[in-house]
Amino acid sequence: LPAQVAFTPYAPEPGGTCRLREYYDQTAQMCCSKCPPGQHAKVFCTKTSDTVCDSCEDSTYTQLWNWVPECLSCGSRCSSDQVETQACTREQNRICTCRPGWYCALSKQEGCRLCAQLRKCRPGFGVARPGTETSDVVCKPCAPGTFSNTTSSTDICRPHQICHVVAIPGNASMDAVCTSTSPTRSMAPGAVHLPQPVSTRSQHTQPTPAPSTAPGTSFLLPVGPSPPAEGSTGD
């Protein structure tokens, strides 16, 4: 004979366990149904009646099959330095991540609790290590023969142009200025010599993720800038 399918609630076999999406209720001493994501247990099971589930109330959620008496509260709305990458729904918590130009200074289980503006390296300093989602930019002084004349969280130190005759020598925060005769470059053999001063500097920019679109009802709250760090500016 085929084994009888047990309908919840039912008493498990001695030493047995409840099936998937069921839990053992200590009070009823029965295997009872769990509630699906987006719902919670409104009424717990008894020996004769199964769990009664109900939808999560506004701004609360459950992500897993559960038998919790109340859904979990969604996190606060994302601040203006963040984008909402996942909305609060009955089945998932809101996730806030830092917007471009910011990094996560204090993370939480999912998303970011506190964003800080990426450090900007001031003139005379270039980016030694670019910022990531979770780490700030590291600035370094421009080495002899290189310069940075920008306040930027992405620009590296660039080589001075090489002049036939130097009008003003370059320094850490300024390129060399050549006299009207054309400058030369250290170039590979066979390279074309361009008549105008052309910088060998490379444009170093960090790729920035496309900003996620928060709901059209997003409200913005102001957040102050992070304090400037060594070799950097808060502007």
Partner: antibody
């Protein structure tokens, strides 16, 4: 842009009933609640109830449980408030307002209001 | 039900004054669920502060909100002519959701 447009003013006799409509545009009706708030002349705001248009689930202030019926028709993006057994004290402006799921009940857009006058 | 009591019920103030309106809940309200609305005569209310302290876009920064538990405040740092209106606090912590009776800010 987001808009909630309500039906026009109504003049009703005591004992009659009235149905006020609130047509939504500029947003997805999913994951929002539609609330009804009333304001008697010269008085404050009074929350009556709300409906989840996606499921039809409603919640009322117990005071309005037998008085107000909330419904919605997602095919025409419209929520309705029906008030029965009208009395003179039901004379008020009735507002619909929406709150997006996850915004902790903040009603960010309101209809222009519908004046219901109950008089014999 | 959670009762929301605003004080004062009305106040007269001059342009440039600092104005504070308080809202006291009869039991604790989570700060995420406390909102303020502004209403002008003959107009629908507008969401003015959400989740205790956050300003929707378009609300001037002279407005601020604070508080926790049972005591919440709306402050206008320097009253402007367009701020004369009635302000309502609103709790969405526990159903039935309730409003304060309103505070009317009038010109002195």
């Amino acid at each position: 842009q987001v808009q909630l447009v309500q039906s026009g003013s109504e003049l009703k006799k005591p004992g009659a009933s009235v149905k006020v409509s609130c047509k939504a545009s500029g947003f997805n009706n999913k994951d929002i609640y539609m609330h009804w708030v009333r304001q008697a002349p010269g008085q404050g705001l009074e929350w009556m109830g709300r409906i989840d248009p996606a499921t039809g689930n409603t919640k009322h202030d117990p005071k309005f449980q037998d008085k107000a019926v909330l419904s919605s028709d997602t095919s025409v993006s419209t929520a309705y408030l029906q008030i029965s057994s009208l009395k003179a004290e039901d004379t008020a402006v009735y507002y619909c307002a929406r709150s997006p799921y996850g915004d902790f009940g903040a009603m960010d857009y309101w209809g222009q209001g519908t004046l219901v006058t109950v008089s014999s | 039900d959670i009762q929301m009591t605003q004080s004062p019920s009305s106040l007269s103030a001059s342009v440039g004054d600092r104005v504070t309106i308080t809202c006291t809940a009869s039991s604790s309200v989570s700060s995420n669920y406390l909102h303020w609305y502004q209403q002008k005569p003959g107009k629908a209310p507008k969401l003015w502060i959400y989740s205790t302290s956050n300003l929707p876009s378009g609300v001037p920064s002279r407005f601020s909100g604070s508080g926790s538990g049972t005591d919440f405040t709306l402050t206008i740092s320097s009253l402007q002519p367009e701020d004369f209106a009635t302000y309502y606090c609103h709790q969405y912590h526990r159903s039935p959701w309730t409003f304060g009776q309103g505070t009317k800010v009038e010109i002195k």
